[in-house]
């Protein structure tokens, strides 16, 4: 089962054909190297998405480098290919599941003075899904608030405040939101999570509060890059990946992700029986895209030599602003109760089979459901423990 | 069945020091971690520290820091408490408790040490 | 370091009467944990990870609370249920216990 969740897997630009870049990665390593012990959470589908979305407006060497800095090569006649991959995909994701709960989506928001084209408008409602609204910016503040509400609504309430502050000369705002709360296939045991010393480094402990569970699991030691990585599905088709560098070897983990050491990993995993613990947490990412993206050469589109001719035929827009963030939640819930027997707590030397893992410092995760739906580090587990019921 | 059995009662000198054993049986400390936890006559609980011995370090509460160290001896299965420049407020009930990644924290005590600090 | 204030120090109850001990901690907790100690004997793990009951810890006993406002809650008292309950954090370090509630049968 997690062969043909290998098999299925886009790991590029999502439905990427021929990739001179390696999209995802290098996004995830210009975060890591922006801020070395933030936590870091991106969706690349979701960024590549909402890239591939505005594309559809941009011309000429704005279009280029869109959809060359996402890695993708495409001759004219692929480009409706694309988009309607995108279409596809996000059908398919933001299906109703029994216990999976995934929002997506994009808007654009744009100053009332800018007319946008029907074309663009029928085409980002029809392959994307996407609303546009007039806004107006000279209004900061109440502007601030019509973006905020409308992400909050469309992610029932799990994404509030997207925006922090708002430049009354903004032209053009593209929000691209991704919330995602899914059940494991087998849950963890309530009563197996305690608090638990996590090192943030080897100076720094914090008390998180640490699911555990002993089962068989996806596993595999990469001696190369040395790590740990162990898969635990989800109900449904997701899988998170856990990767534990060894201790001061995250760095050397980081520079070697790449579609190829993902594709790796899925395909040399084993059943093996583990204790896995892990911190139960909520994890967040915001990033201004359009402070980000220029490394990764796309940057025409946020500056006066913006052509997005296709958008409007104002003849000097430009996106002032990118907003991507996504939201994810780690607890015990799984739709199959975890095994009732008292293997949480027995003695080790009645399991000499079975391995621990404990991710008590600073680890990876990637959400994988065909296409890497998240990407993340976690340096220090978030502490929003509440023990909601609506699980 | 796990066991913590801890050592006798130890009357000692105001400023001189002690060291009291938790020797575990049942388990292998190796996987733990060990508290140790002061109790003065007709008073409440104190945490002093714990060895964890998985990621090999130890952590004190301030107020014991500088006169209390923990450590442990994985080939004779125990675990110390050293306490030094002892004072008549230092007479108590010592008690260890067993920790660790696959048992409940603090779900296994021993039995207690009297330490009388006394001229 | 996190404070926890036991409330009420000491108190009676008559046999079936329902007793609330609280506990609160002056940061917010990941979790509430609650020994039970007679005279002469080593405390006892009673409710754990705010609200599970330990290994032969009688259903008449339940924990509940979350932030910084934690209970442990007897529906019938029972004369064995005399003891001293301490409440304890093991949020933060340093670990830190409540005073102690004495739990006299009437």
């Known amino acids: 089962e997690m062969k043909k969740r290998v098999e299925d897997l886009h790991v590029g630009a999502t439905v990427a054909p021929s990739s001179r870049r390696d999209f995802t990665f290098d996004l995830y390593r210009v975060l890591a190297s922006a801020a070395p012990s933030q936590n870091i959470f991106f969706s690349p589908v979701s960024i590549s998405m909402s890239l591939a979305m505005l594309s559809l407006g941009a011309g000429s060497s704005t279009k280029m480098q869109i959809l060359e800095g996402l890695g993708l090569n495409l001759q004219k006649s692929s480009e409706e290919e694309l988009h309607r991959g995108f279409q596809q995909l996000l059908q398919e994701l933001n299906q109703p599941r029994d216990g999976f709960q995934l929002s997506l989506g994009n808007a654009l928001f744009t100053d009332l003075v800018v007319d946008l084209q029907d074309t663009f408008v029928s085409a980002m409602k029809t392959l994307y899904l996407a609303d546009t609204f007039p806004t107006n910016f000279r209004d900061s503040a109440g502007a601030m608030k019509q973006i905020n509400d409308y992400v909050a609504k469309q992610t029932k309430g799990k994404i509030v405040d997207l925006l922090k502050n708002l430049d009354s000369n903004a032209v053009v705002i593209m929000v691209n939101y991704i919330f995602f709360k899914a059940k494991w296939e087998t849950s963890f045991n309530h009563k197996g999570t305690q608090e638990q010393d996590f090192y943030v480094t080897s100076e720094t402990v914090v008390r998180v509060p640490m699911m555990s569970r002993e089962d068989q699991y996806h596993y595999l030691l990469d001696r190369n890059l040395s790590c740990r990585v162990v898969g635990v599905p989800y109900q449904g088709n997701a899988t998170a990946l856990f990767i534990l560098p060894s201790e001061g070897k995250m760095q050397q983990v980081e520079n070697g992700l790449s579609e190829k050491t993902l594709r790796k990993w899925l395909k040399m995993f084993k059943k093996r029986q583990l204790e896995l613990y892990l911190p139960k947490f909520s994890i967040e990412g915001s990033y201004q895209l359009e402070k980000v993206l220029p490394s990764l050469g796309i940057s025409n589109v946020f500056t006066s030599h913006a052509d997005l001719s296709g958008i409007s035929n104002h003849s000097n827009i430009q996106v002032s602003e990118m907003v991507h963030k996504a939201v994810v939640e780690v607890d015990e819930s799984g739709t199959r109760a975890a095994a009732a027997t008292g293997t949480i707590f027995t003695f080790r030397s009645a399991r000499l089979n079975s391995q621990r893992l404990v991710f008590n410092r600073p680890f990876l995760m990637f959400i994988v459901d065909n296409n890497i739906l998240f990407l993340g580090k976690v340096n220090r587990p978030g502490s929003d423990y509440k023990d909601d019921d609506d699980k | 069945e796990v066991q913590l059995q801890q050592s006798g009662a130890e009357l000692v000198k105001p400023g001189a020091s002690v060291k009291l054993s938790c020797t575990a049986s049942?388990?292998?400390?190796?996987?733990?971690?060990m508290h140790w936890v002061k109790q003065r006559p007709e008073q409440g609980l104190e945490w002093i520290g714990r060895i964890d011995l998985v990621n090999v370090n130890t952590k004190y509460d301030p107020n014991f820091q500088d006169r209390a160290t923990i450590t442990a001896d994985t080939s004779s299965n125990t675990a110390y408490l050293q306490l030094t420049s002892l004072t008549s407020e230092d007479t108590a009930v010592y008690y260890c408790?067993?920790?660790?990644?696959?048992?409940?924290?603090?779900?296994?005590w021993g039995q207690g040490t009297l330490v009388t600090v006394s001229a | 370091q996190i404070v926890l204030t036991q409330s009420p120090a000491i108190m009676s109850a008559s046999p079936g009467e329902k007793v609330t001990i609280t506990c609160s901690a002056t940061?917010?907790?990941?979790?509430m944990h609650w020994f039970q100690q007679k005279p002469g004997t080593s405390p006892k793990l009673w409710i754990y990870s705010t609200s599970n009951l330990a290994s032969g810890v009688p259903a008449r006993f339940s924990g509940s609370g979350s932030g910084t406002s934690y209970s442990l809650t007897i529906s019938r008292m029972e004369a064995e249920d005399a003891a001293t309950y301490y409440c304890q954090q093991r949020s933060s370090y340093p670990f830190t216990f409540g005073s102690g509630t004495k739990l006299e049968i009437k």
């Open positions: 049942g388990f292998d400390i190796r996987d733990t971690f």
């Open positions: 408790a067993r920790g660790g990644y696959d048992v409940r924290e603090f779900a296994y």
């Open positions: 940061s917010s907790l990941i979790y």
